[in-house]
């Protein structure tokens, strides 16, 4: 048993039929010694008396909020949550496996630049009685500070008959140098509590590996005289690290017809302009990627040819 | 410790082309190592990230763009002295700091070159003959060092008499390639910045 936060405890249980469970001793936080009684979840049934209560925790029925009272007055509470271990593996019932980039990916993270700011998100099909708390650090043995905000519900989607809820959190490394060469990964730890069930999820990464620039901005077309060609120009996204001559991007320019089956013309360039042939009803799209370290491409920025 | 924004003479920067070749070569070599050594811990997640130049050179700090010198997190400077002549420094306007930066890059390349050559000698003794260092990568390191053209003592190749542990050598190769790729990215960024300055 360990303390998750004040008055909230996690009991780790091997979860199999007829498992013996864990013996837990609860102590009433009071100087009082006599006349103390214990109840569970504000039920009126008295479970025991005395300053300590010994319980055998085997299943969710044994978890909950234990309260000690004296003469009708509440003295203190202890909330017991369960963390299940089945066949040696901690349960992952609360979050959905996103399966990208590999199986058992519950947390996904992205950064728009090298400033040390990043966003992580996760999915669940649970909509109520759910709380998350997020901690992060650079390295684990001698951790350096990373500050994370509160996790918030960022999207709701319908997937077939099921509703899916996306939660996200923003974190910022306390003292980040954009030019630094990372040798210790960022660790992100999410505590998830659904009713009386506790689970934890972790992710470990280097900022350089989760970079995904915003799409190029100010995408414009300039027709070239007496030609079907156009000059496409764009700018670095505002969120990208500066100076741009040091944090350089490379770009992919794509001409796409109205039909998805039509052949796509693609050009790769390090410049912020390109000359392409604009077909009728086609659109021109540009996306960006770090020029020197091949992490993710940005989403496309698009303009119609007409 | 920073790079001032100088206005170099046109065509001053032959090093940019070489640094791009270097990044391409080390990335290809790393990819080849990951594929060939698929049953060894050779991915970024599996290896320990070691920097053989740590406390010997200070490339990131010495080559910091001027715009980042206001960022206190970037200024944990380590004083290192370097020899300051070289053919990438075609302009007399080039500052001492830029020379310091480029000589730090040169020292990095020299250290990695020695390590890679020592390692290749061991890998050539492996009866499995599973993996060797790409000669192109070694050549590209050499070309960039020549372009930087710093006078420096040659470091003798480390030789060991004992029978090499080939498993450990291959793990070390992965560690070295990952670290060198990261340094090659920094070198490329620096060259691009200097070229634009």
């Amino acid at each position: 048993i360990w303390e998750l936060k004040k008055d909230v405890y996690v009991v780790e249980l091997d979860w199999y039929p007829d498992a013996p469970g864990e013996m837990v001793v609860l102590t009433c936080d009071t100087p009082e010694e006599d006349g103390i009684t214990w109840t569970l979840d504000q039920s009126s049934e008295v479970l025991g008396s005395g300053k300590t209560l010994t319980i055998q925790v085997k299943e969710f029925g044994d978890a909950g909020q234990y309260t000690c009272h004296k003469g009708g007055e509440v003295l203190s509470h202890s909330l017991l949550l369960l963390h299940k271990k089945e066949d040696g593996i901690w349960s992952t019932d609360i979050l959905k496996d996103q399966k990208e980039p590999k199986n058992k990916t519950f947390l996904r993270c992205e950064a728009k630049n090298y400033s040390g700011r990043f966003t992580c998100w996760w999915l669940t099909t649970i909509s109520t009685d759910l709380t998350f708390s997020v901690k992060s650090s650079r390295g684990s043995s001698d951790p350096q500070g990373v500050t994370c905000g509160a996790a918030t519900l960022s999207a709701e989607r319908v997937r077939g008959d099921n509703k899916e809820y996306e939660y996200s959190v923003e974190c910022q490394e306390d003292s980040a140098c954009p030019a630094a060469e990372e040798s210790l990964p960022i660790e992100v730890m999410v505590d998830a509590v659904h009713k009386l069930k506790y689970e934890n999820y972790t992710s470990s990464f280097f900022i350089r590996d989760i970079i995904k620039p915003d799409p190029p901005k100010n995408l414009q077309l300039k027709p070239l005289k007496n030609s079907r060609q156009v000059e496409v120009s764009w700018e670095y996204p505002d969120t990208w690290s500066t100076p741009h001559s040091y944090f350089s991007l490379t770009f992919c320019v794509q001409v796409q017809g109205k039909s998805k089956r039509e052949k796509k013309d693609r050009v790769f360039t390090d410049k912020t302009s390109a000359t392409v042939i604009c077909r009728k009803n086609a659109s021109i799209s540009v996306r960006a990627q770090d020029r020197y370290y091949s992490s993710s491409w940005s989403e496309w920025a698009s303009v119609p040819c007409s | 410790r920073n790079l001032p924004v100088a206005t170099p003479d046109p065509g001053m920067f032959p090093c940019l082309h070489h640094s791009q070749n270097l990044l391409r070569a080390v990335s290809n070599m790393l990819q080849k190592a990951r594929q060939t050594l698929e049953f060894y811990p050779c991915t970024s997640e599996e290896i320990d990230h070691e920097d053989i130049t740590k406390d010997k050179t200070s490339t990131v700090e010495a080559c910091l763009p001027l715009e980042l010198t206001k960022n206190e997190s970037c200024l944990n400077s380590r004083e290192t002295s370097f020899i300051t002549n070289g053919s990438c420094l075609a302009s007399r306007k080039t500052s001492f700091m830029m020379a310091l930066c480029l000589s730090s890059i040169y020292e990095d390349l020299k250290m990695y070159q020695v390590e890679f050559k020592t390692m290749n000698a061991k890998l050539l003794m492996d009866p499995k003959r599973q993996i060797f260092l790409d000669q192109n990568m070694l050549a590209v390191i050499d070309e960039l060092m020549q372009a930087l053209n710093f006078n420096s003592e040659t470091v003798p190749q480390k030789s060991s008499l004992e029978e090499p542990d080939f498993y450990k050598t291959k793990i070390k190769l992965c560690i070295l390639l990952h670290a060198f790729r990261i340094r090659a990215v920094t070198i490329d960024r620096v060259m691009s910045y200097l070229n634009a300055s």
Epitope: D41, F60, T128, D129, L196 | -
Partner: antibody, heavy 119, light 107 residues
Amino acid sequence: EVTLRESGPALVKPTQTLTLTCTFSGFSLSKSVMGVSWIRQPPGKALEWLAHIYWDDDKYYNPSLKSRLTISKDTSKNQVVLTMTNMDPVDTATYYCARRGIRSAMDYWGQGTTVTVSS
Amino acid sequence: EIVMTQSPATLSVSPGERATLSCKASQSVSNDVAWYQQKPGQAPRLLIYYASNRYTGIPARFSGSGSGTEFTLTISSLQSEDFAVYYCQQDYNSPWTFGGGTKVEIK
């Protein structure tokens, strides 16, 4: 001892607003494991959950009725109030309030109040 | 919303016999299912929570099982006071939903 009691009009006219009050004792809505739900049951039919309010004022509604429902609490009076606008004869039912603890099941129920919607 | 389907609608059983009531969820609800008993003119009464946990004061003849989408309430030996309507309910997701009920009557 935990008790809940529903009160409100027995008869409302169509289009009117229904206001129901749940007065409870034996537990507190300021505690971090408690909430109160409203459930209804038309004559001879199944139970239908309407709305829930948590100790921290977080509220959930049945989407099919959300635009017509408002749930609120007065912790000092130990009361939870449900208002339902634009009443219709199909809303004729027994309305229950129930306590929902951290175990998430509704462990204590009021005796119910019957509301008839008729002109 | 998650639909809870109970079967059978009516179950005729003799006192002392075993009664097995079924409840199916339209999607996985983990183990977030409760069972209630309701007698005519009375409010529902909680029997089982978290699919298999007997609530305080509920006799041992009542047991619940299942997880995911299929749940069962078993009354091992029916007593005269057990003849009533039984509802399952999920609160895995909002809106919390009840099944249509199973009426257990005397055969």
